[in-house]
Interface confidence: low
Amino acid sequence: GELETSDLVTVVLGQDAKLPCFYRGDPDEQVGQVAWARVDPNEGTRELALLHSKYGLHVSPAYEDRVEQPPPPRDPLDGSILLRNAVQADEGEYECRVSTFPAGSFQARMRLRVLVPPLPSLNPGPPLEEGQGLTLAASCTAEGSPAPSVTWDTEVKGTQSSRSFKHSRSAAVTSEFHLVPSRSMNGQPLTCVVSHPGLLQDQRITHTLQVAFLAEASVRGLEDQNLWHVGREGATLKCLSEGQPPPKYNWTRLDGPLPSGVRVKGDTLGFPPLTTEHSGVYVCHVSNELSSRASQVTVEVLADPEDPGKQVDLVSAS
């Protein structure tokens, strides 16, 4: 006869490990007992359990409550055992010795591999600002046994670099993702992907990129200069910019205070019915925590087009 076993048994931390040992012999052969031992190169062989055909299972005190026979139905030639709730310390070499009648004794060794799935963590880098050079966006660390694979899934262009630290029974892997911040990256997901044989599927942690920026300011509203004439109602100037964090807007007049009746509402400057007193240089100020911008325009209110005696000025923007 011969022993049917497995060279390598792999189990995830906390699961039950089945250590197989099945004697395949002639129909008239019997298995008297199966002895299980842990084989340690430093500490030698330690008894784990004894499976006797007549007296049943005996477990050594070190493994009490942790070693069982597989559930029924059981074949009398099957000497396999279950090691409950595998821990990392269980990893190593095991031996089964089968005593048969009349063929004698057989033995086989197998290795138990306990996979320790990683628990990844993602740490964002320093605040990102447009105009920076290559900057750390995030780092992702995962520790496990064997060493996990840590990669990044994103549509954002960048570079990734990994380093690993070996511990006695595991390895920690840290991957960093560097990029050159630009406003187009705002709101883009940056996902750390951790792969490991002990995971049913990849673990993913997503960080949403925030890039601080402030766009150049410009002013709309002076496109048609002929609309800016005395008496016109509803004239407005709108300040155009964008930023992260969202910018605040303010309006001033370069050559004095804002004329009475001119109202500031966020990015928009609203005028009452136009008079020549509304002519002047208006400045839009845009700012956020990162920076500030300004854009100025010159408003020249045209004389009433129905009064040909009045001079007609032009509107210009700078």
Epitope: K157, S182, R183, S184, E216
Partner: antibody, heavy 118, light 107 residues
């Protein structure tokens, strides 16, 4: 030295689909973004779109409804399909590699002229 | 879309001349601008990226400057092999766009 080579039919009938392939040699397609750009005869350049080696894409909105870019990492190739073509799609089509910091097309194919005509 | 306007569209110059080409963006694009050279029947070749960084292998007579909305490409001393069409391109926002080109001809 990475080199790019476009291939595909030089003549396509109106309303049909234009199909081109770009083969990357001298280096791996992995880790970079790859783009298609076209240039009508005697005119300027127009960006069509890009693909990452993992398969994610970004297209020019003016062509988005008609464009598909795909990648085959096992063959080190990426491809362009442009459907419902008209004479206005007649152009030299270039494939190009996007620089690592998203700031330039640093390597270009030599280009292939595709004429749309019945 | 961001429009890039190059000026001039055509430029006649002699060998040894200093040549400057301007590219204006319809809105601020920080320094996300590249310059390419294209000769007839050939693919464009990268000269400058990030507005002012010289691509490896490109002669030092080429230089770029600018930020925001106004950029320039300068050829300090025009050589016979520099007669070509030059394009600027922005990477600040999608869709990425090119200027209409500046053709540098022999005077």
């Amino acid at each position: 030295q990475v080199q790019l080579q476009e291939s595909g039919p030089g003549l396509v009938k109106p309303s049909e689909t234009l199909s081109l392939t770009c083969t990357v040699s001298g280096g791996s397609i992995s880790g970079y973004y790859w783009s298609w750009i076209r240039q009508p005869p005697g005119k300027g350049l127009e960006w069509i779109g890009y693909i990452y080696y993992s398969g994610s894409t970004n297209y020019n909105p003016s062509l988005k409804s008609r464009v598909t870019i795909s990648v085959d990492t096992s063959k080190n190739q990426f491809s362009l399909k442009l459907s419902s073509v008209t004479a206005a799609d007649t152009a030299v089509y270039y494939c190009a590699r996007l620089g690592i910091f998203f700031d330039a097309f640093d390597i270009w194919g030599q280009g292939t002229l595709v004429t749309v005509s019945s | 879309d961001i429009q890039l306007t190059q000026s001039p569209s055509f430029l006649s110059a002699s060998v040894g001349d200093r040549v400057t080409i301007t590219c204006r963006a319809s809105q601020g694009i920080s320094s996300y601008l590249a310059w390419y050279q294209q000769k007839p029947g050939k693919a464009p070749k990268l000269l400058i990226y990030a507005a002012s960084t010289l691509q490896s292998g490109v002669p030092s007579r080429f230089s770029g400057s600018g930020s925001g909305t106004e950029f320039t490409l300068t050829i300090s001393s025009l050589q016979p092999e520099d007669f070509a069409t030059y394009y600027c391109q922005q990477f600040n926002s999608y869709p990425w766009t090119f200027g209409q080109g500046t053709k540098v001809e022999i005077k």
